[in-house]
């Protein structure tokens, strides 16, 4: 059947919590990436952000699975849920800043 | 070497607000967050709340409406107040850092903890 | 709220026993859990996180184990100096909890 919010939302953090701690070399090659506006549609934000890195095989999980939290197909190149568009940073950075906000919405049970 | 240190009054009176600093050295309060604990004599510990290392915060919904916490990132210090002080809130205060690369919320260095007593 | 209930709330045993202290979420919190140890007039210690890391410096004869709503602390071989009060505590959701404790003392 299908994954319950919160399993899901449980599983992304844990999958940016190895890529943090495993992270040696700098995160998909210092690659930079779109910040966004850690509010509402941020999933498809995130992913309209990180689908534009290829060739970086330690995000391509994270980007299946916020591919799962995104109701529309999103393609390199868009950038609809993108509002803000002003600040690159690096994967690196993005990946930290992600975690915390999704942690805190796990804390206060924050899954949809 | 991580050190999180608490400083504040030791005996506090009945309505009045509690004022306590906790100033650390090791770490940075950007990189981690800072969490607040008590432990009434004798009881079990509670958790207060949490200065995230972006300067957000969250509490525990129970003691919400009587906490705040704020931060000094150039004095490494965080400060938690709490009003309308009770006997009831009479415990060892906390405050440790969390371990925050990791998917759970713990608590890896404590201070030593400073002693509140709520009396007229 | 999660309740962590622990026990036994305490218990005596004797250099070299095995000792095992158990905790019992009220709702299923994964692996989302600590345990700390705690000497009177200190603040506790950590010993594992994420239900069976072990802390850096934390001796090997502490282990933990379990998942989703019930966890254990195992001393494989008790030391003079493990006599103390022990805690768990779930990182899963706020507010975080801890159990009431389990005091060791010495038989």
């Known amino acids: 059947g299908p994954v319950p919010p919160s399993t899901a939302l449980r599983e992304l953090i844990e999958e940016l919590v190895n890529i943090t701690q495993n992270q040696k070399a700098p995160l998909c090659n210092g690659s930079m990436v779109w910040s966004i506006n850690l509010t509402a549609g941020m999933y498809c934000a995130a992913l309209e952000s990180l689908i534009n890195v290829s060739g970086c095989s330690a995000i391509e999980k994270t980007q299946r699975m916020l591919s799962g939290f995104c109701p529309h197909k999103v393609s390199a190149g868009q950038f609809s849920s993108l509002h803000v568009r002003d600040t690159k940073i690096e994967v690196a950075q993005f990946v930290k800043d992600l975690l915390l906000h999704l942690k805190k919405l796990f804390r206060e049970g924050q899954f949809n | 070497q991580v050190t999180l240190k608490e400083s504040g009054p030791v005996l506090v009176k009945p309505t009045e607000t509690l004022t306590l600093t906790c100033t650390v050295s090791g770490f940075s309060l950007t990189n981690y967050h800072v969490q607040w604990i008590r432990q009434p004599p004798g009881k079990c510990l509670e958790w207060l709340g949490v200065?995230?290392?972006?300067?957000?915060?969250s509490f525990n919904s129970v003691l919400k409406s009587r906490l705040t916490i704020s931060r000094d990132t150039s004095k490494s210090q965080v400060v938690l107040t709490m009003t309308n002080m009770d006997p009831v809130d009479t415990a060892t205060y906390y405050c440790?850092?969390?371990?925050?690369?990791?998917?759970?919320?713990?608590?890896?260095?404590w201070g030593q903890g400073t002693l509140v007593t709520v009396s007229s | 709220d999660i309740q962590m209930t622990q026990s036994p709330s305490s218990l005596s045993a004797s250099v070299g026993d095995r000792v095992t202290i158990t905790c019992l979420a009220s709702?299923?919190?994964?692996?989302?859990l600590a345990w700390y140890q705690q000497k009177p007039g200190k603040a506790p210690k950590l010993l594992i996180y994420?239900?069976?890391r072990l802390q850096d410096g934390v001796p090997s004869r502490f282990s933990g184990s379990g998942s989703g709503t019930d966890f254990t602390l195992t001393i494989s071989s008790l030391q003079p100096e493990d006599f103390a009060t022990y805690y768990c505590?779930?990182?899963?959701?706020?507010?975080?909890?801890f159990g009431c404790g389990t005091k060791v003392e010495i038989k």
């Open positions: 709702e299923d919190i994964s692996n989302y």
């Open positions: 440790a850092r969390d371990g925050t690369i990791a998917a759970m919320d713990y608590f890896d260095y």
């Open positions: 505590q779930q990182g899963y959701r706020f507010p975080l909890t």
């Open positions: 200065m995230w290392s972006d300067g957000d915060t």
């Open positions: 994420h239900t069976s």
